[in-house]
């Protein structure tokens, strides 16, 4: 069967001030299982900006009803946007591990910038 | 505090149809999806059915699909279990659970009693 | 199938290792079902191969590795006498199976 892949379809996303920017990204496979993550930027110092598995991410809505068995998608939208959003957001796919999750693979990310409220 | 409750077991004859209901509060229902799992008398747990936190998709074990139909009343908190052709087979406490995000179990209902007999 | 040993025994205070084969590590999610009595409600000891829930003490714990998952209870003790039962979901069919459940006694 084919490796799992994270797709990110667009490599940039620009977005009004006050609006909410949606974040798109699909899986080619549910194999491994393991929770999917997004996060702003990369390396030791990126953010958390969701996880599937736990935590409240409250200007955060998946697009997806994540709990269908079956679903691939894992785009997600985030309200309320301001200058300080700005930055490359990655979905990044984990593997199941013990005692924590591994990471399996990454999407080549999305760079949100964020556009001056209309006046 | 999460609570399951199962209700709408009975006596039924072969043949006939019956609806089982769980009835949760404590959690944000709408948010969750749940499973029906049952065990027979002195057997193991089964799992039945599940149905997605919205409600648009099932899933089946095949030995219910076309017998068996899971459905939610999200504003009612309410799940049920829609039983149809039943057999001796079908003899069994019948639980309510709520799935991880991963589909497993976290939360089961105290069960409702289901027999089959003529 | 899982499958899993009909039963164990320990005397108190001592481990407990109830194990669980038959799942495919890359696709199977385990978990750990508590049943002490037929017909009464089970509780869930072990999620998501070893995750415990809050209220379950920290005695109960859960590995997995290549086909197989382990529940371990360390220090048993008298109450934990029940019906042990390790469940998987398959991320490939979407279904979710039960082994046929283990009976611990503690002497």
């Known amino acids: 069967e084919d490796e799992l892949q994270v797709i990110q379809p667009e490599k940039s996303v620009s977005v009004a001030a006050g609006e909410s920017a949606t974040l798109r990204c699909a899986m080619t496979s549910l194999i491994p299982v393991g929770p999917i993550m997004w996060f702003r930027g990369a390396g030791a110092g990126r953010e958390l900006i969701y996880n599937q598995k736990e935590g409240h991410f409250p200007r955060v809505t998946t697009v997806s009803e994540l709990t269908k068995r079956n679903n691939l998608d894992f785009s997600i939208s985030i309200s309320n946007i301001t200058p300080a959003d700005a930055g490359t957001y990655y979905c990044v796919k984990f593997r199941k591990g013990s005692p924590d999750d591994v990471e399996f693979k990454s999407g080549a990310g999305t760079e949100l910038s964020v556009r001056a409220k209309p006046s | 505090d999460v609570q399951l409750v199962e209700s709408g077991g009975g006596v039924v004859r072969p043949g006939e149809s019956l609806r089982l209901s769980c009835a949760a509060s404590?959690?944000?229902?709408?948010?969750?999806?749940m499973s029906w799992v049952r065990q027979a008398p002195g057997k193991g747990l089964e799992w039945l059915a599940g149905i997605s936190a919205g409600g648009s998709d099932t899933y089946y074990i095949d030995s219910v699909k076309g017998r068996f139909t899971i459905s939610r009343d999200n504003p009612k908190n309410s799940l049920y279990l829609q039983m149809s052709s039943l057999t001796a087979e079908d003899t069994a406490v019948y639980y309510c659970?709520?799935?991880?995000?991963?589909?497993?179990?976290?939360?089961w209902g105290l069960g409702t009693l289901v027999t089959v007999s003529s | 199938a899982l499958t899993q040993p009909a039963s164990v025994s320990a005397n108190p205070g001592e481990t407990v290792k109830i194990t669980c084969s038959g799942g495919?590590?890359?696709?199977?999610?385990y978990a750990w079902y508590q049943q002490k009595s037929p017909g009464s409600a089970p509780v869930t000891v072990i999620?998501?191969?070893?995750k415990r829930p809050s209220d379950i003490p920290s005695r109960f714990s859960g590995s997995a590795s290549g086909s197989a998952a382990t529940l371990i209870i360390t220090g048993v003790r008298v109450e934990d006498e029940a019906v042990y039962y390790c469940?998987?979901?398959?991320?490939?069919?979407?279904?979710?199976?039960f082994g046929a459940g283990t009976t611990l006694t503690v002497l």
């Open positions: 469940g998987g979901y398959d991320g490939r069919t979407y279904i979710n199976t």
């Open positions: 404590g959690f944000t229902f709408s948010s969750y999806a």
């Open positions: 495919d590590y890359y696709s199977t999610y």
């Open positions: 999620h998501s191969d070893d």
């Open positions: 659970a709520r799935e991880t995000w991963n589909h497993l179990f976290d939360y």
